[in-house]
Every structure is written in structure tokens, then in C-alpha cells.
């Protein structure tokens, strides 16, 4: 029961996490740009992995895609790749984990197969979560190191007057969504891996079979009713796996006057 709950919870947590990773990847608010002393008008800029948007004080919003690949920083391309890999792995993991769920019966699938599938999906979720966390962290690092406080000195012409305009880059909502979603996917993956241990069928413990050579005692095998005496090849408490063998715990048969052949 606990295994089923752990597996089910892992699946749900991973599902929420992957939905979050997809949402973060599609969101436009990865970074926001503010001008400290904007000399023109109140305009708010924010950027995602795929396009840049502007929102005016009037409420007008317009977005424009990054149509060039060559002009984009390599880091941005890396972040895109990490997020897409995370989504793809997560989606495959979800597909695998649906069939691995203990509560879902598909044909005559054995527990060992479900255990393997659960482990596979768990590993996929872990890698997916790590990809998302890595992608978001790389982007955040790119903002902090390259763009955080960009100061531009511009001449206004006559007199050589200079105005310094500072652009402040701040973390957008998508970064936090990505971090949380990646964490959830990671946790879900760990839960699936834990559930896998409980699903995996352990080796069956067969009790040792002992034969006592007491008089003319006979062990009866149901298959064809062929009798074997206690003095045969199985005298050393070997495990035998046919239904005719009786263990020490069972009631011993007493010697009878007749041997049934």
C-alpha cells in the first residue's frame, strides 16, 4: 500500500513539475529591465527565451520574437536546449510511469517489469528536473554576470555633456517557476526510485526440505504417483520445487504396512 502511495505521489509531483517546466519555458518573464532614470516615458521591458516584450503605462503590450540565431548569446541557446531536453525527458518519463503505476493493470505485466519501468521513469524525472534547474540557474548567472547593472554613458552633443543611464536587470517570474518546477520533478523522480525498491519482487524464500529415513516412509509425488524412498538423491535437505515435497513443519507421514506404487 505504501509503495503504491509513494509511486502515485511521485507521479503526481512529477506531473506538476513537468507542467511547471513547460510553463516556465514558454513564459516571457525570464528577465525584466528597468531604467532608473528613464528620460522619456514609463515603458516596462521583459524578456523570455523566445521573445522580448514591452508594456507601456497605457497598458499596451507588444512582443517580438528573436528571429536571429546568430545574434543570440551561446548561453541563451544552452538554456533553451536544457529546458527542451528537460521537457522531452519528463514527457517520456510520464508516459513510461503511467504504464508502471501499480494501480493500473495492463495485460499480464509482472511486478519486475513495473519495477524496472518505475525506476526508468524515476531516473528520467531526476534528469529532467536537473536540466530545468541547470537551465534556469545558467540564465540567472548570465543576468548577474553580464547584464545585471549595465551602465551606458552617452554624449548629448554640444558641450560634451554625458548622461549615465543605468539599466537594471531583475529576475523574472519564470526563473522562480522553473526552479520550483525543477525541484518538484526531481523530488517526484526520487519518490519513483524509492517506490521501485518496494515494487521489485524479492527472491522467494523456500523452506528447506528434509527427508527422514524412518523405516519405510515414502514421499509421494502427485505427478504419476511415483514413490521415491527417503534414500534417494535428495537426502541432504536440498530445495526441491515440486508440489509433492513436504517441509519439516508439516505433519510427517507415519510408516504404513503397504507401499503404494
Amino acid at each position: 500500500m505504501a509503495v503504491t502511495a509513494c509511486q502515485g505521489l511521485g507521479f503526481v509531483v512529477s506531473l506538476i513539475g513537468i507542467a511547471g517546466i513547460i510553463a516556465a519555458t514558454c513564459m516571457d518573464q525570464w528577465s525584466t529591465q528597468d531604467l532608473y532614470n528613464n528620460p522619456v516615458t514609463a515603458v516596462f521591458n521583459y524578456q523570455g527565451l523566445w521573445r522580448s516584450c514591452v508594456r507601456e503605462s497605457s497598458g499596451f503590450t507588444e512582443c517580438r520574437g528573436y528571429f536571429t540565431l546568430l545574434g543570440l548569446p551561446a548561453m541563451l541557446q544552452a538554456v533553451r536546449a536544457l529546458m527542451i531536453v528537460g521537457i522531452v525527458l519528463g514527457a517520456i518519463g510520464l508516459l513510461v510511469s503511467i504504464f508502471a503505476l501499480k494501480c493500473i493493470r495492463i495485460g499480464s505485466m509482472e511486478d519486475s517489469a513495473k519495477a524496472n519501468m518505475t525506476l526508468t521513469s524515476g531516473i528520467m524525472f531526476i534528469v529532467s528536473g536537473l536540466c530545468a534547474i541547470a537551465g534556469v540557474s545558467v540564465f540567472a548567472n548570465m543576468l548577474v554576470t553580464n547584464f545585471w547593472m549595465s551602465t551606458a554613458n552617452m554624449y548629448t552633443g554640444m558641450g560634451g555633456m554625458v548622461q549615465t543611464v543605468q539599466t537594471r536587470y531583475t529576475f523574472g517570474a519564470a526563473l522562480f517557476v522553473g526552479w520550483v518546477a525543477g525541484g518538484l520533478t526531481l523530488i517526484g523522480g526520487v519518490m519513483m526510485c524509492i517506490a521501485c525498491r518496494g515494487l521489485a519482487p524479492e527472491e522467494t524464500n523456500y523452506k528447506a526440505v528434509s527427508y527422514h529415513a524412518s523405516g519405510h516412509s515414502v514421499a509421494y509425488k502427485p505427478g504419476g504417483f511415483k514413490a521415491s524412498t527417503g534414500f534417494g538423491s535428495n537426502t541432504k535437505n536440498k530445495k526441491i520445487y515440486d508440489g509433492g515435497a513436504r517441509t519439516e513443519d508439516e505433519v510427517q507421514s507415519y510408516p504404513s504396512k503397504h507401499d503404494y506404487v
Partner: nanobody, 122 residues
Framework: QVQLVESGGGLVQPGGSLRLSCAAS????????MGWYRQAPGKQRELVAA????????NYADSVKGRFTISRDNAKNTVYLQMNSLKPEDTAVYYC???????????????WGQGTLVTVSS
Amino acid sequence: QVQLVESGGGLVQPGGSLRLSCAASGSIFSINAMGWYRQAPGKQRELVAAITFGGGSTNYADSVKGRFTISRDNAKNTVYLQMNSLKPEDTAVYYCNADLLVGGFPRRNVYWGQGTLVTVSS
């Protein structure tokens, strides 16, 4: 690199008209807003008019309201300032200002033109 090229300044009689234009060129991703500032000799620089390129919201200094009109041409990345009923106190160097996003993964910066002189005198 981004360049702002201003034109249209000159000498005009009081009550006359002038049309200033400012064209932005270079590695521009998009334009947030453009505007005109002016600086008369011995005075502080002041905003004359500004316009956002997306929605076309405008902002005017009280001293020019009703006389000056700012407009933009998105396709040409150009802003225009139509100045009517000019007064001697409008004499100043007029500077173009542009709030731009520049580059492939755009960075926001404010750029200034070199200025064009407008003289209102009889």
C-alpha cells in the same frame, strides 16, 4: 552600434513652422520610445515631447502643448516633431532621445543625438 541622425533645424521667424526628424539606425531590436529635448543657452535641458512606439502614447511639456505635435514612423524607425507658432523662447538646441532595445538578445539603453539648432528670430 546605434546612430541617431537629426535634421530639420534652422532659422525661422516668430509664428513660423519647422519640422524636425530623427532617424535611428543600427542593431536595433525594437524601439520603446523616442522623444525630443531642448537646451537653451545657460538653461537646463528639458523634455519637449515624447512618444512610445508601440501604443503611440504621447507626452508634452506644458509650454508647447497645442503648438507642437510629435509623431512616429515605425517602419522607418523615425520620430518627427512638427513645431507651429514658434516663439523666440523656443530657441534652443533640440536633442533627439531614443529608448531602445539593442542586439540579438536585446539590452535596453537610452541614446542621444548630437542635436540640431533651432533659432526663432525676426
